[in-house]
Interface confidence: low
């Protein structure tokens, strides 16, 4: 029985040329996370494997950086980056959990940054 839930940064917006942090958090389960995939529509952006660590897809290596945590940092944003992003948690024994984030990249300087972090 899958009891876990995925929390995400939800719908976020950012300025063209800027950076944004995509975050997902799997909670309410004791399942072991074996791998997290980050995907944009049908394209694989990055993988974080429990044994092998991070792998960034070669076509995104210049613009995608790992972290914080299992999150992903996107930089040099363009309007073409607008769209759905998915964090896919592969777990044992539960199976697969998927979280969805919608990113809108705006031309203007009124973009509202959804991914904020509090400094302890």
């Amino acid at each position: 029985m899958m009891t876990g839930t995925i929390e995400t940064t939800g719908n976020i917006s950012a300025e063209k040329g800027g950076s944004i942090i995509l975050q997902c958090h799997l909670s309410s389960t004791t399942a072991q996370v074996t791998q997290v995939n980050w995907e944009q529509q049908d394209q694989l952006l990055a993988i974080c494997n429990a044994d092998l660590g991070w792998h960034i897809s070669p076509s995104f290596k210049d613009r995608v950086a790992p972290g914080p945590g299992l999150g992903l940092t996107l930089q040099s944003l363009t309007v073409n980056d607008t769209g759905e992003y998915f964090c896919i948690y592969h777990t044992y024994p539960d199976g697969t959990y998927t979280g969805r984030i919608f990113l809108e990249v705006l031309e203007s300087s009124v973009a509202e940054h959804g991914a904020r972090f509090q400094i302890p």
Partner: nanobody, 117 residues
Framework: EVQLVESGGGLVQPGGSLRLSCAAS????????MGWFRQAPGKEREWVAS???????WYADSVKGRFTISADNSKNTAYLQMNSLKPEDTAVYYC???????????WGQGTLVTVSS
């Protein structure tokens, strides 16, 4: 308990250099990556650079060609060499990392870098 301790900040003139260090301790196992963020007064915290345990590095566009991130895996220490510093680089610089492989990650207390003549 994971601890991240940054050092190396200070006052430097425009065009000058600084080297920041971040010593990480208390890990159950070594982090897969380490990184630097910064926060200028009145602004949001922004990502600066990341380095994978395997050595691959990434940089924000604003620091490319001026900053170099590196790590000594045996010491769980990350470094940020900052050259050709500009007044707009003035900020508190924070080190961050994951705790090996899980969601949790940690922040250091930060080190202040002031670029001014």
């Amino acid at each position: 308990e994971v601890q991240l301790v940054e050092s190396g900040g200070g006052l430097v003139q425009p065009g000058g250099s600084l080297r920041l260090s971040c010593a990480a301790s208390g890990f159950t196992f070594s982090p897969s990556w380490m990184g630097w963020f910064r926060q200028a007064p009145g602004k949001e915290r922004e990502w600066v650079a990341s380095v994978l345990r395997g050595g691959y590095t990434w940089y924000a566009d604003s620091v490319k060609g001026r900053f170099t991130i590196s790590a000594d895996n045996s010491k769980n220490t990350a470094y940020l060499q900052m050259n050709s510093l500009k007044p707009e680089d003035t900020a508190v610089y924070y080190c961050t990392t994951d705790r090996g492989y899980n969601w949790n990650y940690d922040w250091g207390q930060g080190t202040l870098v002031t670029v001014s003549s």
